[in-house]
């Protein structure tokens, strides 16, 4: 049980005046005082591995990662970054400590990652791990959390690799369905990264920072619940971690759980079991199946079996790239003025989408609900019976999806009229799109019943206002008509609306507005 070398890891921030990629040196620069990075031996690790606290660096900042080694004799070293070896030149300070430095000038995203320093001394070999990440408001990210088993104990760590570092919370619920909604009294929140109580019905982990909140649910098969009519499906991208929990309750401890992938037992080390007695002295067992980084061959049917319950399965599908599956054909709807109606998009997506509903250049919040068949649905009901074009847009980092909807509100026309020196125009927005008549009011026809057969030009649906179709009709004025009153009427299946105009008038003259239903 020898005395280990005393290792000190520090971060030195520099005032910038040059630029380069990582250099392993003692490059002279104007520097701030060193910051300790809490380098410590990683407990229970194979070999001697020291770990430094994560370093957060602003874009374009220059830093030095430095290790001071209090060990007798010479040392040799090697830096490894992203599988590339970098030159390492140790030197000794006035206190005869070995000093190894890695200079990162003008930090960029490509220089972020894990820097490994391998040191060999006369007495021992060891590794020092530095994790360098970028802190920059332009590079703020919020990544969906994922789970990892805590080393040497039955607990899950929730990790979200986001910038700025998010606040992580577990959202736990022991009820079923609707009562597990976010603000329900049945929901318990724990603002911590590690969760030991893994027996709950519904377990989610959420991460939040300046960009919002992202959550991941622990995928669970409950052998005491009636299986869904469709097989539950879990999508993952290559390289992501897989976690499935199988849960079962029985009157006593005399039962066991097992996981199989395509009828083959999972390998040792890719599952772990926990059990506890519940308040009514029944035994709860949970068995986790996990893969730290999935590959295509991890796709398949994962079946949880029990000696006392019917087995249940889930289909795990590993994809190279995320997707959004939905029909993108545009849809038209016509509804009555007081009819209740919601737009609806049914989709299957992985990772979970972020979405918006847009109308009249205004974005509305988008809610999505998971369905039992593996699909999700987003509904939009807040249209306030305004006709026009509504757009659903979804994206998830790998895929984008847009769907257009047109909403028409059945109502009788409403006419707007205006006149210029040479013509009179009427427009209407009723639906179905109206037809037009023009009548002349004269001594012969005081009720304005005399048709004007010529000079009328109808433009149906020529103007689109945020998706709302407008029909217009124009009367070209002849000299003989000047000084007369004319009436334009728009009619559809729901009614008629008219506007009377005095020709030769410079503007609209709503002398009489008739409404004949």
């Amino acid at each position: 049980n020898q005395d280990l070398p005393v290792i000190k890891c520090v971060l030195i921030n520099h005032k910038n005046n040059d630029s380069s990629v990582g250099k392993s040196s003692s490059y002279p620069m104007v520097s701030e005082s060193p910051e300790d990075l809490g380098c410590a031996l990683r407990p229970q690790s194979a070999g001697t591995v020291y770990e430094a606290a994560t370093v957060e660096v602003d874009v374009s900042a220059s830093i030095t990662l430095q290790v001071l080694v209090d060990t007798p004799g010479n040392i040799s070293c090697l830096w490894v970054f992203k599988h590339s070896s970098l030159n390492c030149q140790p030197h000794f300070d006035v206190q005869n400590r070995g000093v190894v430095s890695m200079v990162i000038l003008k930090m960029t995203e490509t220089q972020a990652g894990e820097y490994l320093l391998f040191i060999q001394s006369e007495a021992t070999n060891y590794t020092i791990v530095f994790t360098v990440s970028i802190r920059n408001t332009l590079l703020f990210t919020l990544r969906r959390p994922y789970f990892r088993k805590m080393e040497n104990q039955d607990a899950l760590v929730c990790i979200s690799e986001s910038v700025p570092e998010p606040i992580v919370e577990w959202v736990l619920c022991d009820s079923q369905g609707e009562s597990c909604k976010e603000e329900s009294p049945a929901v318990v929140k724990k603002e911590e990264k590690v969760l030991h109580e893994l027996f709950g019905t519904d377990i989610r982990c959420c991460a939040r920072n300046e960009l919002g909140r992202e959550c991941t649910r622990l995928f669970t098969i409950d052998l005491n619940q009636t299986p869904q009519t469709t097989l539950p499906q879990l999508f993952l991208k290559v390289g992501e971690p897989l976690w499935i929990r199988c849960k079962a309750v029985h009157v006593n401890h005399g039962f066991g759980l097992t996981w199989e992938l395509e009828n083959k037992a999972l390998e040792e080390g890719s599952y772990f079991e926990m059990s506890t007695y519940s308040t009514n002295r029944t035994m709860i067992r949970i068995l986790f199946a996990f893969v730290s980084s999935v590959a295509r061959n991890d796709t398949g049917y994962y079946t949880c079996s029990s000696s006392k319950h019917p087995s249940q399965s889930a289909l795990v599908t590993i994809v190279e790239k995320g997707f959004i599956n939905a029909t993108n054909s545009s849809e038209d709807y016509e509804i009555d003025q007081y009819e209740e109606f919601c737009f609806s998009v049914r989709f299957k997506a992985y990772p979970q989408i972020r979405c918006t509903w847009t109308f009249s250049r205004k974005a509305f919040p988008c809610e999505q609900k998971a369905l039992d068949d593996g699909y999700s649905v987003s509904k939009f009901c807040n249209h306030k019976h305004q006709p026009g074009e509504y757009i659903f847009h979804a994206e998830n980092g790998d895929a984008q999806f847009t769907k257009m909807f047109t909403l028409n509100i059945r109502r009788k026309p409403q006419v707007l009229a205006e006149a210029s020196a040479s013509q009179a125009s009427c427009s209407s927005d009723g639906y179905p799109l109206p037809s037009w008549t023009w009548k002349k009011c004269s001594d012969k026809s005081p009720n304005c019943t005399e048709d004007i057969p010529e000079g009328v030009w109808n433009r149906k649906a020529n103007r689109k206002v945020f998706g709302q179709w407008v029909s217009s009709s124009t009367l070209n004025m002849s000299e003989a008509m000047k000084g007369f009153l004319v009436k334009c009427c728009a009619y559809n299946s729901l009614g008629t609306s008219c506007e009377t105009i005095l020709l030769n008038s410079p503007g609209p003259f709503p002398f009489i507005q008739d409404s004949i239903s």
Partner: antibody, heavy 123, light 108 residues
Framework: QVTLKESGPVLVKPTETLTLTCTVS??????????VSWIRQPPGKALEWLAH???????SYSPSLKSRLTISKGTSKSQVVLTMTNMDPVDTATYYC???????????????WGQGTLVTVSS | EIVMTQSPATLSVSPGERATLSCRAS??????LAWYQQKPGQAPRLLIY???TRATGIPARFSGSGSGTEFTLTISSLQSEDFAVYYC??????????FGQGTKLEIK
């Protein structure tokens, strides 16, 4: 050289609020995984953890004292402030601040401590 | 809340001899246990974390063992500067940390 130094009143009256400041140097509280905890020790008794704060503002409190405690970062990034309301003579103790370092999946507990400040609660 | 119980409350050992201090947790804390040494008028000093990993600069005569609920701190050959109070602390359900009541190691 990592140092932590506690400062605050040495004498507090019952029902008053105690405000303690921990000034750190040699490490940064803007570093992603650095945190500071407050721990107290009544004369001749054991240590009791009170609260902690991490550089990302994640904070936590002792369940038995949660309603009385508030931990925050001071105006300077090198300070952590603890306030404890409704002080009582039983709160007489030496109050320490200590550094904590969190890694991705493990934790280094209190590796550096301040020298402590004795707070007496008496009328 | 996890309760940490240390035994004995006081341990009398002669310099050069071996000292064994025990710590028991009311429920499993896995390997997330630390040991601290505190001398009169001083702040505690981290000796061991992860149940068995020595902190930086701690001599090899200090060793920790155990996992789950039973833990031991062993000082193989006591030096005069080792006489102090020793505390165990669990950080398994961090961010909640609890300390034992301490063992006083005195010169026999």
């Amino acid at each position: 050289q990592v140092t932590l130094k506690e400062s605050g009143p040495v004498l507090v009256k019952p029902t008053e609020t105690l405000t303690l400041t921990c000034t750190v140097s040699g490490f940064s509280l803007s570093n992603a995984r650095m945190g500071v905890s407050w721990i107290r020790q009544p004369p001749g008794k054991a240590l009791e953890w009170l609260a902690h704060i991490f550089s990302n503002d994640e904070r936590s409190y002792s369940p038995s004292l949660k309603s009385r405690l508030t931990i925050s970062k001071g105006t300077s990034k090198s300070q952590v402030v603890l306030t404890m309301t409704n002080m009582d003579p039983v709160d007489t103790a030496t109050y320490y601040c200590a550094r904590i370092v969190g890694y991705v999946d493990w934790l280094l507990p209190f590796d550096y401590w301040g020298q402590g400040t004795l707070v007496t609660v008496s009328s | 809340e996890i309760v940490m119980t240390q035994s004995p409350a006081t341990l009398s050992v002669s310099p050069g001899e071996r000292a064994t201090l025990s710590c028991r947790a009311s429920q499993s804390v896995s390997s997330n246990l630390a040991w601290y040494q505190q001398k009169p008028g001083q702040a505690p000093r981290l000796l061991i974390y992860g149940a068995s990993t020595r902190a930086t600069g701690i001599p090899a005569r200090f060793s920790g063992s155990g996992s789950g609920t039973e833990f031991t701190l062993t000082i193989s050959s006591l030096q005069s500067e080792d006489f102090a109070v020793y505390y165990c602390q669990q950080y398994n359900n961090w961010p909640m940390y609890t300390f034992g009541q301490g063992t006083k190691l005195e010169i026999k």
